[in-house]
Interface confidence: medium
């Protein structure tokens, strides 16, 4: 399969290279935020597959924002093959084995396996179907082969790799991390408030992904969707985590410039290649 040997540029009439991301936020589009500072920051561009500079306004934005080029590369790229996978002579685990389990933001509830660095074992978890990270395996065996130590304390040596011409890195061929934004949408936190079909007027909260806040709405008592919480705290706990909007310590004042709506920078329908 030559699909990883493509050039860096998209060529629309040939096979396109799969994309594997260590962290889901690496796919977010750079967001300068509504403030007006001029701060040089870096983001990972999924199309060029490189960390690039952008000007950050100083507040809000998203997690695809790094103080330095090195930090960005560390979080989002695999240009240093040894960082991700050591040579089989060294028998070391790839870095993503040490990532925490990440169910992502969607609601597929798919059974997957991840390597738990605390217990040093592969364990089952429920994957939502999108986002997440590379510590995500379709089978227990696959997880064990890649991340667990063999009986002699060495990593099992059947971790197939292939040179990826896109960023000159080695990418695991056996990890079938599902499409990053597979058509498993939408996440309930991204759906609009839905009163439902009944006639009650119950006070509820929903997560407004445009402004990144939990807002009250009147629930009819039946139907609707799962973007429906009995308290603001419950709403924030469930939804805010995925869309952190960090205010800078500088305490910048938002100007009266027309505020750019804080839409989620990725559509949860985004449909990617299966083997990301």
């Amino acid at each position: 399969d030559s699909e990883e040997d493509e050039e860096h540029t998209i060529i629309t009439d040939t096979e396109l290279p799969p994309l594997k991301l260590m962290h889901s936020f690496c796919a977010f589009k750079a967001d300068d935020g509504p403030c007006k500072a001029i701060m040089k920051r870096f983001f990972f561009n999924i199309f060029t597959r490189q960390c690039e500079e952008f000007i950050y306004g100083g507040c809000e934005g998203n997690q695809n924002r790094f103080e330095s080029l090195e930090e960005c590369k560390k979080m989002c790229t695999r240009d240093n093959a040894n960082r991700i996978i050591k040579t089989t002579l060294q028998q070391e685990k790839p870095d993503f084995c040490f990532l925490e389990e990440d169910p992502g933001i969607c609601r597929g509830y798919i059974t997957r396996y991840f390597y738990n660095n605390q217990t040093k074992q592969c364990e089952r978890f429920k994957y939502g179907g999108c986002l997440g990270n590379m510590n995500n395996f379709e089978t227990l065996e696959e997880c064990k082969n890649i991340c667990e130590d063999g009986p002699n304390g060495f990593q099992v040596d059947n971790y197939g790799t292939q040179l990826n011409a896109v960023n000159n890195s080695l990418t695991p061929q056996s990890t079938k991390v599902p499409s990053l934004f597979e058509f498993h949408g939408p996440s309930w936190c991204l759906t609009p408030a839905d009163r439902g079909l009944c006639r009650a007027n119950e006070n509820r909260f929903y997560y407004n992904s445009v402004i990144g806040k939990c807002r009250p709405f009147k629930y009819s008592g039946c139907g609707g969707n799962e973007n429906n919480f009995t308290s603001k705290q419950e709403c924030l706990r469930a939804c805010k985590k995925g869309f952190i909007q960090r205010i800078s310590k500088g305490g910048l004042i938002k100007t009266k410039r027309k505020r750019k709506k804080q839409r989620v920078k990725i559509a949860y329908e985004e449909i990617f290649v299966k083997n990301m």
């Epitope: 699909e3 998209i10 096979e15 991204l190 839409r263 559509a267 985004e270 990617f272 290649v273």
Partner: antibody, heavy 118, light 108 residues
Amino acid sequence: QVQLVESGGGLVQPGGSLRLSCAASGFTFSNYSMTWVRQAPGKGLEWVSGISYNGSNTYYADSVKGRFTISRDNSKNTLYLQMNSLRAEDTAVYYCARIYYMNLLAGWGQGTLVTVSS
Amino acid sequence: DIELTQPPSVSVAPGQTARISCSGDALGTYYAYWYQQKPGQAPVLVIYGDMNRPSGIPERFSGSNSGNTATLTISGTQAEDEADYYCQSYDAGVKPAVFGGGTKLTVL
């Protein structure tokens, strides 16, 4: 080289049915989600339906919901669009397209014309 | 739902610069793509990810996207650039693809 070839279009009466096919080659079909886009004569492009790489999730534009069904057979490298209860306003060239990063439609077929008329 | 608005037509003299706009609420927070379509043919991708050119697309094609507007710029427009151009983005709803109404570029 990526190739998408649509077939199954033709003339059908209002209320009738048609099944469009899109034969894919030159890429690993089962790795990609796919979509149908249509274009009425002299009009713009309109997204119709989409399906995940393994067929487990399907999406439809409001205008076709309940009447059209998208499906795929990965063993045959083929995408389908079953169109029932056809209306005059469904008359269009139907394109299948492969979906790439961030909903980019990278790779289109040449289209098949569906005419709904009595 | 995000709606994308394009001017129905743009005219430009050969060798001049053509600019086709695509506006939508907070469009700059999404990636924008541009397709060129000539009569009787399927759309062809000319710009992806706001500003990137696929291989085979001439350097005179460029793109930008910020605020509420994405712009396709064709510098030194040539007769063969005469076509319909569509912007596309995605919806933070249930549509994986949202298209602008299309702009007919006429090279005078």
